[in-house]
């Protein structure tokens, strides 16, 4: 049994780190492999993660953690029974992928404006809470040529779009993702998308 692509891990900077790797051939990850992890810290213990399959030769493991701070460093050991397949380390603060924003809602009852709101995926006491900026993707199912990214660089998880910039009488979808500038993170996954119908019509005298 051999590791084809070494484990690569990212942390949500809250309670879960996700490690993914590829094996040399088809593997029943949960039956054959264990990923052991231990914080380099006085009197820490070794914890075990049971991986899941992620495609034919891919495995993924979700490491449960108490929280994450900058000094934390983990040793990682990938075992197949009594055989050590790979040994490495992982510093969560240096490999952060934020959680995806949630509760994306579209408010169309605001005059002349489409208001999008969503929730910050972190509690206020988390370091990332005040560091997230967002990208909102809006596209049309009726007009394949229409797709826009709106960068939200302020802290408030809202975006206002003049309804007049969207075509009337067609449906749109929106989704949002996040990243944290000061932690040099990757982008989060996209939130689930939300659909709405743009019924806005310009006043008669402006037509």
């Amino acid at each position: 049994m051999k590791v084809l692509q070494e484990p690569a891990c990212v942390s949500d900077y809250m309670s879960i780190s996700t490690c993914e790797w590829k094996m040399g051939g088809p593997t029943n990850c949960s039956a054959e492999l264990r990923l052991l992890y231990q914080l380099v810290f006085q009197s820490s213990e070794t914890h075990t993660c049971v991986p899941e399959n992620n495609g034919g030769v891919g495995c993924v493991c979700h490491l449960l953690m108490d929280d994450v701070v900058s000094m934390d460093n983990y040793t990682l050991d990938l075992w197949a029974g009594q055989q050590l397949l790979w040994k490495g380390s992982f510093k969560p603060s240096e490999h952060v992928k934020p959680r995806a924003p949630g509760n994306l809602t579209v408010h169309t009852n605001v005059s002349d404006t489409v208001l999008l709101t969503w929730s910050n995926p972190y509690p206020p006491d988390n370091y990332l809470y005040n560091d997230l900026t967002y990208a909102v993707n809006i596209w049309s199912e009726n007009d394949p040529a229409y797709s826009r990214i709106h960068n939200v660089t302020y802290l408030k998880p809202t975006l206002r779009i003049p309804a007049s910039t969207l075509k009337s009488g067609i449906s749109y979808r929106a989704r949002v993702r996040a990243w944290a500038q000061h932690y040099n993170t990757t982008w989060s996954e996209w939130s689930p998308s939300t659909k709405w119908y743009n019924s806005y019509r310009e006043p008669f005298e402006q037509r």
């Epitope: 006085q42 009197s43 820490s44 213990e45 449960l64 953690m65 108490d66 900058s70 000094m71 934390d72």
Partner: antibody, heavy 125, light 112 residues
Framework: EVQLVESGGGLEQPGGSLRLSCAGS????????MTWVRQAPGKGLEWVSS????????YYADSVKGRFTISRDNSKNTLYLQMNSLRAEDTAVYYC??????????????????WGQGTTVTVSS | DIVMTQSPLSLPVTPGEPASISCRSS???????????LDWYLQKSGQSPQLLIY???NRASGVPDRFSGSGSGTDFTLKISRVEAEDVGFYYC?????????FGQGTKLEIK
Amino acid sequence: EVQLVESGGGLEQPGGSLRLSCAGSGFTFRDFAMTWVRQAPGKGLEWVSSVSGDGGNTYYADSVKGRFTISRDNSKNTLYLQMNSLRAEDTAVYYCAKDRLSVTVRPRYYGLDVWGQGTTVTVSS
Amino acid sequence: DIVMTQSPLSLPVTPGEPASISCRSSQSLLYSNGYNYLDWYLQKSGQSPQLLIYLSSNRASGVPDRFSGSGSGTDFTLKISRVEAEDVGFYYCMQAFQAPYTFGQGTKLEIK
């Protein structure tokens, strides 16, 4: 009541061996790291050794490394210190103490909040 | 190893008066979770040590509020707001940041 009771001390000749025991009660023994601290006559406190709750990680002072072995039997709620190749300078009162909660991913520390009454080890010919 | 240095080594105090003991470490005891792994212990004559303060400033259960701890990084202080006769004994600081844990030399508090 949370309690630690040491035993096993006594008089031993240089080069000899002793095994100290520390019985814990009133708390979930397995969840906590444990520590041995000693005090030579008229001297201050000296840390000797620590062990994580699962027994998987052990730590020793340089002065005892290679001679002393810390271990634990969580089924008996008991901590041990096996002392070999004893020297005159090992003469001290030995205390066991309850250390950090080590079952969490990052152990949680509340100080060495419970101490045993101590057991006296005398190494002399 | 982290070296712990206490001062003064002897502290004669009048009952009712305040007392202060300093402890300095050779390297920072602050972990990035915001905690300083520094404790204070009192050992009364013929007794086992007892925990007074943990993580620099947290009073242990049952410890009178006249005892307080402060400091961060490498400089720490134990204060007794009003010394009582029962407070006599040896006071030790100890770092639990990493093994080997190390103690200060001890401060002997005595009543004038």
